[in-house]
């Protein structure tokens, strides 16, 4: 779980170590705050849960790319 260190900054201290099913994910955001000890990707699930992931892992990069494509494709 991401930890809020103040009202505007969220840091991740531990990363999920297993793949999340892609279809459960709604969106993501990157956390690159200089307050945080490590850079992270925070995935938001369809159930509104936030999950910290390691941005250097290939599956995390693939999931971000998948979500980018999803947001670029307008729903008809």
């Amino acid at each position: 779980q991401p930890v809020g260190i103040n009202t505007s900054t969220t840091c991740c201290y531990r990363f999920i170590n297993k793949k999340i099913p892609k279809q459960r994910l709604e969106s993501y955001r990157r956390t690159t705050s200089s307050h945080c000890p490590r850079e992270a990707v925070i995935f938001k699930t369809k159930l509104d849960k936030e999950i910290c992931a390691d941005p250097t892992q290939k599956w995390v990069q693939d999931f971000m790319k998948h979500l980018d494509k999803k947001t670029q494709t307008p729903k008809l």
Epitope: R30, T32, S34, P37, E39, D68
Partner: antibody, heavy 121, light 111 residues
Amino acid sequence: QEQLVESGGDLVKPEGSLTLTCTASGFSFSTSYWMCWVRQAPGKGLELIACISSSIGVTYYASWAEGRFTISKTSSTTVTLQMTSLTVADTATYFCARTTDDNWNVGFNLWGPGTLVTVSS
Amino acid sequence: AYDMTQTPASVEVGVGGTVTIKCQASQSIGNRYLSWYQQKPGQPPKLLIYGTSTLASGVSSRFKGSGSGTQFTLTISGVESADSATYYCQQGATISYLDNAFGGGTEVVVK
């Protein structure tokens, strides 16, 4: 007004060492920013070298700079770049830059004028 | 790797014209993670745009940033002679990978 000034640029021989200093005024590192060193060889583009968190001191380096360059926060208003085993290819203007706020994704809105490092025998 | 590539390397434009500069990332950097800078000879770069499309403080609305994923664009409309400069893009997606964070630059020459 917020300002960055680099110092320490010099003419140095190949294999020599040099330490550059970036001095901030008008703000202090108690507000967290990414402080970075960026260089520009004559007539060439911008190259990021290293960055440090002004609050907690976390550092990141370009892969080519790791081991030869060291970024440090030496006070609440100064950041240094130690450079070793310098080669002619390190000849450049070295800039100190600060992010707009604590996030990496907002770009560098504050730059120093630069300091020139010349490596030549 | 998030290597940034800019095209063209150089472009000539007449006063009042429009110039488009492209920046390509080697992998997707999302839609909010690109900055643009203007640099004039003998000066440090100046931040123009961050977050892909947000104008930095004091920057003219003639500068417009757009794009997402791997393709980004800086458009300068109603070009003025003062716009003669070199323009750089920079990825803001990851600080873990600093290599080639800046594009190679585009020199804009205003005729």
